[in-house]
């Protein structure tokens, strides 16, 4: 079967890094400069991606795999395969159409990318604010206010010793 298949379609035997060359009687030719084929049996090679401008080359193109780009310092990748580069902001900021803007009160961003997110609402979990939030950091929630009432201890008292022969009440 293999022999029959290869005689019917010689292109099926062309490995990755080559293409089935009609100009050379359908023998497998190497992909030309700045192109690649990542799978076998190709009739053409794909043009290598070029990492220009704000993109920089993370991995060079080879005859069997495309180039991979990342972003120059001050920018970060967005999209599948780093299809876009977006400007970094500082922590405590978010990128808007007008550039980097500080997070509004009550929100924070602890990264150089992404949007400002609201501080955690500790009271929703019945807890209190232990450390206040900032533009760069979320609040830190602590024990519930009831746990902090006068006379309350954060240390659980030991269980009373049981006398033998008595079941617990």
């Amino acid at each position: 079967f293999e022999r029959t298949r290869s005689l019917q379609d010689p292109c099926s035997n062309c490995p990755a890094g080559t293409f089935c060359d009609n100009n050379r009687n359908q023998i497998c030719s190497p992909c030309p400069p700045n192109s690649f084929s990542s799978a076998g049996g190709q009739r053409t090679c794909d043009i290598c991606r070029q990492c220009k401008g704000v993109f920089r080359t993370r991995k060079e193109c080879s005859s069997t795999s495309n180039a991979e780009c990342d972003c120059t310092p001050g920018f970060h990748c967005l999209g599948a395969g780093c299809s876009m580069c977006e400007q970094d902001c500082k922590q405590g900021q978010e990128l808007t159409k007008k550039g980097c803007k500080d997070c509004c009160f009550g929100t924070f961003n602890d990264q150089k990318r992404g949007i400002c997110r609201p501080w955690t609402n500790c009271s929703l979990d019945g807890k209190s604010v232990l450390v206040n939030g900032t533009k760069e950091r979320d609040v830190v929630c602590g024990p519930s206010p009831a746990d902090l009432s006068p006379g309350a201890s954060s240390v659980t008292p030991p269980a009373p010793a049981r006398e033998p022969g008595h079941s617990p009440q």
Partner: nanobody
């Protein structure tokens, strides 16, 4: 033009090794890729191994892991180290040089005269 001279073929037992050489002379500046193809009687010419001027290598599926292509730029020579040879590797092995990619095809396409490799006990 480019002249290609192959050497190193011969008779070898299954499991044995051979090293083919292909020496290029002439207008070698025009060459982008060099490599080896083989043709057994009644079969199509198939790619064995290729190496580009940038150093990328490609191998035919049937020889991966057994054959290694390399080059010596100073000597303008390409080598094919063939290990763990099998009877099905028996063929005439041709050296090929390609260059001048223009308008969707290679302008320069040079072939050696071929060297016979026979794998038999």
């Amino acid at each position: 033009a480019v002249q290609l001279v192959e050497s190193g073929g011969g008779l070898v037992q299954p499991g044995g090794s051979l090293r083919l050489s292909c020496a290029a002379s002439g207008s070698i500046f025009s060459i982008y890729a060099m490599g080896w193809y083989r043709q057994a009687p009644g079969k199509q010419r198939e790619v064995v191994a290729l190496i580009t001027s940038g150093g990328s290598t490609v191998y035919g599926d049937s020889v991966k892991g057994r054959f290694t292509i390399s080059r010596d730029n100073a000597k303008n020579t390409v080598y094919l180290q063939m290990n763990s040879l099998k009877p099905e590797d028996t063929a005439v092995y041709y050296c090929n040089a390609l260059g001048g990619w223009e308008n969707g095809k290679y302008k320069y396409d040079y072939w050696g005269q071929g060297t016979q490799v026979t794998v038999s006990s």
